[in-house]
Interface confidence: medium
């Protein structure tokens, strides 16, 4: 912590500018007005302050705003955001999507840091739900964001937000997460026609129950094997050979290559050999 010392004559900073890089730590503490710093935060990033000088500037902001920074300051933190601890961020009330974007921009290209995770948590909790615009923004910066949420957190995602989800956003989701997301997707896309509906719902099908898979098998959807392999085993087991054949269409031949892997393996063991033989793939039950 920097000691409180009087500012030397003529060194009081009239504005935040490059001349301050020549100030010692104690001079910055004594000669830079915290309120001035807060109003001119947008200048800080373009001045080559040393890490130690930035520590002093952060300390001044912390003293000025012990209950947490106002959004007007947060929005202009730039890479000083990287110096904030999760504890600092928990004091913030970030409501503007523009502020969120500005700070995510700082961390862009890097894995999600504890600071970013805390910021997102605060923002989403403040909004009460994960609305479409927020989800759009978060998945643009972190494609794996959705799958990092617990099933409980996912339950606050309104069906309308599902329109913002891209297939790659679900790549790392486990079955428990898809169980929560699938009914929302089904609701969101319910007014679409058959082929369009399947394109949209496909990446959520890892949460689909048996009856929905049976219904899809009646719609000539030609599900690919990659999607089939992600279906819930308990949802696949009750399907008949005829239903799986209709569900997969021309992709049914791919079952042979996957016969040793779940859910195909378990499904094969549940079928009568006579029925499997109708596929002509040499599958052994």
């Amino acid at each position: 912590e920097v000691e409180k010392t009087a500012c030397p004559s003529g060194k009081k900073a009239p504005e935040i500018d490059e001349s301050l890089i020549f100030y010692k730590k104690w001079e910055l503490e004594a000669c830079v007005d915290a309120a001035l710093l807060a109003t001119q935060m947008d200048r800080v990033n373009a001045i080559p302050f040393t890490y130690e000088q930035l520590d002093v500037l952060k300390h001044k902001l912390d003293e000025l705003y012990p209950q947490g920074y106002p959004e007007s300051v947060i929005q202009h933190l730039g890479y000083l955001f990287l110096k904030m601890s999760p504890e600092d961020i928990r004091k913030w009330n970030v409501t503007s999507l523009e502020t969120l974007k500005a700070l995510l921009e700082v961390n862009k290209g890097h894995e999600m840091s504890p600071q970013v995770a805390t910021l997102i948590d605060r923002f989403v909790k403040g909004r009460g739900q994960l609305d479409k615009d927020t989800l759009d923004t978060l998945t643009a910066f972190y494609p794996g964001y959705l799958c990092s949420l617990s099933p409980e957190e996912l339950s606050s995602v309104p069906p309308s937000s599902i329109w913002a989800v891209r297939p790659q956003d679900l790549d790392t989701c486990d079955p428990r997460q898809l169980d929560v997301l699938y009914p929302k997707a089904r609701l969101a896309f319910q007014n679409m026609n058959g082929s369009e509906y399947f394109v949209k719902i496909q990446s959520f099908l890892g949460g689909a129950p048996t009856e929905d898979l049976k219904a899809l098998s009646q719609q000539n959807v030609s599900m690919d094997l990659a999607t089939f392999m992600k279906l819930r085993t308990d949802a696949v087991l009750p399907l008949t050979v005829a239903e799986v054949q209709k569900l997969l269409g021309p992709h049914v031949e791919g079952l042979k290559a996957e016969e040793r892997h779940r859910p195909v393996r378990d499904w094969i063991l549940r079928q009568r050999q006579d029925d499997l033989d109708t596929l002509g793939l040499g599958l052994q039950g």
């Epitope: 040393t50 890490y51 890479y79």
Partner: antibody, heavy 116, light 106 residues
């Protein structure tokens, strides 16, 4: 992911100048200071200076002030370093890098050889 | 400018052995940063703010120190740790690096 692309090598004659490039991708180019670092064969690392792509502000190591000039082209997310009046002492690998608290990204380096 | 002196200049260690190298600053600094560099590769950040591990760095690496005296420790040497290690300060300009400690596998 964040990447800094640099050409592999430059062969230049004594007394000439060379302009090294560093193309950035995977992050917002205008946010971070871009640093340049020199490494002579078998030697340690020397900091040359840094430039802020958005403002064009620079901060040089006094030792390199008359040797290096840092610039950026925001439209192509590319940083440049011009080295002038080259001598054999300038033969080295030159790295561009982002150096920040908990992360760093370095270019692969450009090997400059000064030879007649 | 702040001069950083690293010692030893060269050292060797056997797999599983504990390794400690030091970095002494000519005047006090608040933080030290440590980089690892292997032949033909760019440097890589290991430790930031004196003691924090950068992303993806194995937990066998640790940093400590304050003022003018800092150190980097590898709790159990592994073959892949053979490299040159540099300390770096950003307390005042120009940024400076130590001359490096070359760690060889015994």
């Amino acid at each position: 992911q964040v990447q800094l692309q640099q050409p592999g090598a430059e062969l230049v004659k004594p007394g000439a100048s060379v302009k090294l490039s560093c193309k950035a991708s995977g992050y917002t180019f205008t946010i971070y200071w871009m640093h340049w670092v020199k490494q002579r064969p078998g030697q340690g690392l020397e900091w040359i200076g840094m430039i802020h792509p958005n403002s064009g502000n620079t901060n040089y190591n006094e030792k390199f002030k008359s040797k290096a000039t840092l610039t950026v082209d925001k439209s192509s997310s590319t940083a440049y370093m011009q080295l002038s009046s080259l001598t054999s002492e300038d033969s080295a690998v030159y790295y561009c890098s982002l150096i920040h608290w908990y992360f760093d990204v370095w270019g692969t380096g450009t090997t400059v050889t000064v030879s007649s | 400018q702040i001069v950083l002196t690293q010692s030893p200049a060269i050292m060797s260690a056997s797999p599983g052995e504990k390794v400690t190298m030091t970095c002494s600053a000519s005047s006090s600094v608040s933080y030290m940063y440590w980089y690892q560099q292997k032949p033909g590769s760019s440097p890589r950040l290991l430790i930031y703010d004196t003691s924090n591990l950068a992303s993806g760095v194995p937990v066998r690496f640790s940093g400590s120190g304050s003022g003018t005296s800092y150190s980097l420790t590898i709790s159990r040497m592994e073959a892949e740790d053979a490299a040159t290690y540099y300390c770096q300060q950003w307390s005042s300009y120009p940024l400076t690096f130590g001359a490096g400690t070359k760690l060889e596998l015994k």
